[in-house]
Each structure stands twice: as structure tokens, then as C-alpha cells.
Interface confidence: low
Amino acid sequence: KLTIESTPFNVAEGKEVLLLVHNLPQHLFGYSWYKGERVDGNRQIIGYVIGTQQATPGPAYSGREIIYPNASLLIQNIIQNDTGFYTLHVIKSDLVNEEATGQFRVYPELPKPSISSNNSKPVEDKDAVAFTCEPETQDATYLWWVNNQSLPVSPRLQLSNGNRTLTLFNVTRNDTASYKCETQNPVSARRSDSVILNVLYGPDAPTISPLNTSYRSGENLNLSCHAASNPPAQYSWFVNGTFQQSTQELFIPNITVNNSGSYTCQAHNSDTGLNRTTVTTITVYAEPPKPFITSNNSNPVEDEDAVALTCEPEIQNTTYLWWVNNQSLPVSPRLQLSNDNRTLTLLSVTRNDVGPYECGIQNELSVDHSDPVILNVLYGPDDPTISPSYTYYRPGVNLSLSCHAASNPPAQYSWLIDGNIQQHTQELFISNITEKNSGLYTCQANNSASGHSRTTVKTITVSAELPKPSISSNNSKPVEDKDAVAFTCEPEAQNTTYLWWVNGQSLPVSPRLQLSNGNRTLTLFNVTRNDARAYVCGIQNSVSANRSDPVTLDVLYGPDTPIISPPDSSYLSGANLNLSCHSASNPSPQYSWRINGIPQQHTQVLFIAKITPNNNGTYACFVSNLATGRNNSIVKSITVSASGTSPGLSA
């Protein structure tokens, strides 16, 4: 069937359109185009005779039409009047007519739209704003954009006038946005420049900052007020209802209790004509006195006296706080607080209770601290120590002994030799000593405040000959692979060389052997059973030398994994079973046996006469060393065969 296709169907003014013919019959005489839906000679555009290839313009020809041999019609420089139907009249060679009608629509190219507004400064929650998209254009579709998004669904938004007008009812500050309109028709789409809606709002209820309402006397009061408002609000301050100033900030230096009261900020928007106020109540507190500590005993004696510390002044309905060494009070049965926390009692003071102590008074705003107080605890003297620790000296050297005892106040010292007072000094010095200076040297420490005295006695031997040394040990029964042993060669003597021997040989080089204290101490780390040897120490100086008696180290070890003998595991029925268990251990271990898990006897040897196949099973030997606390075991399987079935041993 003959059809007409318009390309394009929607044509912009000034452009061109092609009326394309489909299914054109063969054997044609010619064809003619008409404006309209029917063949009307008065509205003929152009006729075409194929045989002569002659095109003849008709009454409706505008000079913008071109006809093609395939009957298609091109219309150029389209105008609005070209809209409508076009009919092709085909005359076949047999002069039979055929008609087809096509159509197209002409639309103008749209201009760039603009937005007009009926209210450039609408007031929030009061005004409505109507935006209109200009110009009004026929056959155009109007669209709206808010912040480049399509319109949100809202009962406050209404489109009218064929969507050309957008009305925002009861505008809010949130409607402050970028608005654009767009015009569309089938051939073009144009978007307007954005219009920013300037909504007048507020002032909202102002906020006063900072939020705190409590101040101390002497501080500066600096209040700032802010209210959301467009245009920005004008601010006024009132104190207790009296106007102060028209500023956003209120500053009062060095406030007093008299500045307490209600502070009102008023925000005014000259465009909306609205006022909003916010009130804050400011309380100014008087500065409390700085606390201080009094004590009922300024020089308490250790382990005797109690001390009561009191926080002054006494103020009713006040919270008292205490700190020791800059920390809150530790839990201790020796610390007691009074009901009001004002008095802290230290029962039976010690030298560690010196402090410092602080008390505090808590008020509405902060905690005021006292100055720290330190206790002067009287203690000691402790047992004095005499140094150096040498007990043997050679004639001709100088003897210089020093005495010290922990004490508060510091101790007074006295020296006695063989019970006779020598001098009241902390140090005792005797030059060029002889054997006659041997004796008992006593240091006496005295605390004048507590009246206590303590003494220490040291035996000093002055001799050219060195004494026979002896070995002391810090562990007489060390455990293998666990303990260390420190041997010390006694006595400690001045200008003396210390030597060591093991089993009569000089010390082997070993990372487990360490000499210290001027070679006077020999330490064996991680002892092993091989360290159970004879140890001898020697001392020598330029005049004499001497050796100690040997000391044998008794290393506890084991039990090692036991061995069951004989090794056989197959026996003939009727034989005697005689199993012996042995484990290396010091001291000797305790033995026990289990057969198939059942405890048997606590002996080293297990004997069973005339065994049978019933004695088949697992035989376990358990060993235990009570000194090392260690245990061990071994399991052996025994098979008993009926006589004659397999070779075996008989006991």
C-alpha cells in the first residue's frame, strides 16, 4: 500500500522536511502533491510527468519545494503555516489513480525563558511567592527545577497556568534555593537562568552563649547572642529588665555578686518586624577563702603517735576533700576521716607518712586547694651499719670505720672499743694499726628526740697471718636445671686476693660460672649433676696464704627415665618373672609398679612366680623424687606363651 512518511514528523521553523514515499507502484504516468487531506486543484503544490521528466508548479507552490523522481517531496525553510496534511496523487500508466496522505507539525525554536516573581522578599510562614516562566509560548511544556532537582512533592508547592506558574505557599527558610524553569516543545528545550529565592525569616528564639550560668566573683562576663534571621537580626541586651546596649555581645569585666540576675537578649528583624527574646539567669558566687591545714602534732614519733590534720576554716554545708602525694586518699586502716571529712587522722604514723597532704573545699564551680603540708615524723635510729665490711686487717694500715643509722632527726653517734667510749663521731679513724687494735668495735646511734638508741658490734682482727677461710653457700641442696648456687669465701679481708678450685683444678671456663665481689663470690647458674664436686677457696696477701676445707655440692636431680631389666618381653608359661627398675636420681627415688594400670607394690623389684598367659600385659614402673618434686615412668609389654609354643626365658 502506498504510504507517506514525514522525516522528521516534528519540524523546527527554518529547517526542512522530507515527505518520503513508500511502496510507489511501477508503470507510472506521473504524480502530483497537494496541501491538505484531499486532491484539490486549487491547492496543488507541484505535478510531475515521468515520461517528460517535467515538473509543473501548482497554485500552492512556494518555491521552497523540490520533487524527486521517486515522488518524495522536500520542503525547505519551513514556516509555521506549513503544518498539516500533504496528499500524494499517483496516476498509474493505466490511468488508475492512487492516493496517500502524510503530515508533519511545525514548531518554533523556543527562546531562553526567564522567571518573573510576584514577591522578591517573601516573609517566612506568611507570604506566598508565585514564579512565572516567561514568555508564554503556545504548545510548550513548562518544567521547574529546584537546586537542579525536579520539584519535590509538597502540599506547599502548586503548579498552575499550564505549569507555567509555580506558587510556594507559606514560604519557609528552607525554600531559599535556586529555581529554574524550562520550556520544552517537540523540537527544542531551553532552561532559564537561576533565580535565588530570598526568604525573610526570623528572628528565631535567640541562643545565648556560653551556656554556663555560674561565675565566680572577679571573672569577666562575656555573653554572645545569636538568632537565625534574614536579614541578620539587630540585638539588644537587658539586665533585670533594664536596657543595657544594642550589641550582639555583652561584656562586663570583674563581675561581683551584684551582677547576678536575669540577662535578656532581644533579637529584632527590621524586615519581618518580629522580635524574639531569650532569658538566661546568671549567678555570681563569692570567692571562698583558701583552705589551710592545722595539725595537732607537728613532730609525731613513728609507731607511737597519731596525728590529726584538720582542714580550716570550718564552713557549714561544705564538702571537704583530701589528697596524699597528689592522689586521693588510699584505703588504709590507719587513715580515718571524721563524719564531715574535715579531719584526717593518721593512726600510728610511720616514716612513710610524711606526705605532702592537701585539703580542698568544694564549691559550686570548682575545688579550692590548700597549700601542701609535710609531716615531720620522728623515727629511728634503726640498727646502725658499719662500713667497710672487712674484719681482717694487716698491721701498719689505717683503720677507717663509718657508721650510719636511718633516723629523724639525724642520729648522734658514739664509738666504743671493747666496751670503752672512744669518741662521739660518725667516723672512727685509727692510723698505723697493730695487733693490739684487734677487738670489739661498737657503734652506738642515738636519737635525741625519741630518746632511742641502737648499737652494732663488729669484730676487727689485726694480724699479719691470714686466717683459714671457709665457704658459705646460699643453697645447700640446689635442684638440677633450676637453681643457682652462690659460694662466698669468708672472711672479707682488706688487700686480699681470692682464688677458687674445683676438684683440685683451677676454675674451668664456662658461661654458667661467674666470679664477683672481687672474686670472693663464685656463682654457678643452672646447676647440673656434674656440678656435684669439691669446691675450695683460697685467700692470699703479700705475707701469707690459706685454703678452705673443701665443700661438696649436693645437687638434687632426677628421676631420669627409668630402665626395666632384663630387656626381654617374651616369656614361657611357668617361668618366674623378675623385673628390676632403675632411675638415676638424687636422692634415690621411690619406686612403684602397675600392671595393666592396676597399682602393685612400692618396690624396686617386681617378682611374680610361675607366670601364665594371664600375666600378659603392660608393666609400668613409676619413679618419684620427693626432693625435686619430679616424677617419671616407663612402660614395658610382657607376653607369656603357653609351654612349647615359642622360645623364651625361664628364671
Epitope: N147, P152, S154, D204, A228
Partner: antibody, heavy 121, light 111 residues
């Protein structure tokens, strides 16, 4: 500190009336909208209505329109819910909640403890 | 009227697990890109308590394990690691337009 205390609930016969109060402290109700929300036993939350105490404008849910009236007394910082022609389906716990930029940032941030209304013959 | 649909109706989880609650609005509740959708928690015999306002803002005093997300019509409340005190009924509510509406609630119960 923001506080809301509802009162006035109780047992009432169908067709009867009740007046609920919502006393606010810690803020000025003029700065907010005051909403009423109810919760029937074992059910969810249902918005009843709201008032702008600054100008008295109010809005209502369809289910209570024409029967309930919301009012406010800014001098007492209190909102009210007058309930007339009560029905069994009005049985619920009634809450009041402020709503606005400064007090609740456009959400119902503060709620009273609720007052119970029982409509039964 | 904007209808809010919450899912699931009941959620059974154990303490320490992550909870995800959904709220779908019948139409967009955004005003210039901000969702006027809020989440509330309610325990038996107590008033509702605001958890999240305007989609994703945690209300004062609400622990950091609660978070909100979403815009337009789809919103989510997430509890990253459930504590025993979190088992309650959760409602979403919109203040986009009158009448204000709430979801039917999601009951979060101990598994």
C-alpha cells in the same frame, strides 16, 4: 533541662469529654510547635495534632478533626488537648512533644511520660 | 498522607550482632536533599526516645553504635553491635508534612 509533664487522663464513657494538660519547663513553648501523639494499647504511634503557641494556629489528624481541640497558654508554658465526643478507639496513652528548630531540631526529641485515657462504658 | 513501612516486623538477634532496620516512605520526605525522617526507640511502659534525627544525625546522649542513613524514600537504622539494653521496639517517623506519620514499628528481640 527540658521536661514535659502530661496530666488529665482517666476513665470516661463514650461520648464524654476530657482535657489533657502538658506542662513544659526548660524552654519557652512559644519557640516551638507543641504536638500530641497517642499510642493505643499494643499498637504503634499515631500523630494527633499540633499547635503553634505563638499564634494559636493548629492542625489535626483526620481521625480526631472536629472532636479534639489543641490550645496553649504561653504564660503558663502549657499546652492542652480538649477531647470531646470520645470513642472507644480513642483509648490510648497520650504524649506531648515539642517540635522546632531550637528545642528539638525538627524532630520529636523530648517526650513526656504520657497520660492514659480509657474510653469505656 | 505519607505512609511509612518498616521491615522486618520482628528481628531476632543475639547481643554483639549487627542489626539493620529499614523504613520506606510512600513518597520522598526530602527537603532540598535532607530527609525529614527520624528513628525512635521505645521500651515497654516508657515513652519513645529519639535516636536519630533527620536521617543520619545522632541525638544527644545516643551511643555511637547507633547510626542512620538514607534519603528520599529509603532509610536504614543500623546498630553495629547489640547491647542487652538495645532490645526494644523501633519506630521511624516523618515530619516532612502534615499529618506527621510513624511506621508500624520493628520489634528487636533476643534470639
Amino acid at each position: 533541662e527540658v521536661q514535659l509533664v502530661e496530666s488529665g487522663g482517666g476513665l470516661v464513657q463514650p461520648g464524654g469529654s476530657l482535657r489533657l494538660s502538658c506542662a513544659a519547663s526548660g524552654f519557652n513553648i512559644k519557640d516551638t510547635y507543641m504536638h500530641w501523639v497517642r499510642q493505643a494499647p499494643g499498637k504503634g504511634l499515631e500523630w494527633v495534632g499540633r499547635i503553634d503557641p505563638a499564634n494559636g494556629n493548629s492542625k489535626y489528624a483526620d481521625s480526631v478533626k472536629g472532636r479534639f481541640t489543641i490550645s496553649a497558654d504561653t504564660s503558663k508554658n502549657t499546652a492542652y488537648l480538649q477531647m470531646n465526643s470520645l470513642r472507644a478507639e480513642d483509648t490510648a496513652v497520650y504524649y506531648c512533644a515539642p517540635f522546632g528548630y531550637y528545642v528539638s531540631d525538627y524532630a520529636m526529641a523530648y517526650w513526656g511520660q504520657g497520660t492514659t485515657v480509657t474510653v469505656s462504658s | 498522607e505519607i505512609v511509612l513501612t518498616q521491615s522486618p516486623a520482628t528481628l531476632s538477634l543475639s547481643p554483639g550482632e549487627r542489626a539493620t532496620l529499614s523504613c520506606r516512605a510512600g513518597e520522598s520526605v526530602d527537603i532540598f536533599g535532607v530527609g525529614f525522617l527520624h528513628w525512635y526507640q521505645q521500651k515497654p511502659g516508657q515513652a519513645p526516645r529519639l535516636l536519630i534525627y533527620r536521617g543520619s544525625n545522632r541525638a544527644t546522649g545516643i551511643p555511637a553504635r547507633f547510626s542512620g542513613s538514607g534519603s528520599g524514600t529509603d532509610f536504614t537504622l543500623t546498630i553495629s553491635s547489640l547491647e542487652p539494653e538495645d532490645f526494644a521496639v523501633y519506630y521511624c517517623g516523618q515530619t516532612y508534612e502534615d499529618p506527621y506519620t510513624f511506621g508500624q514499628g520493628t520489634k528487636l528481640e533476643i534470639k
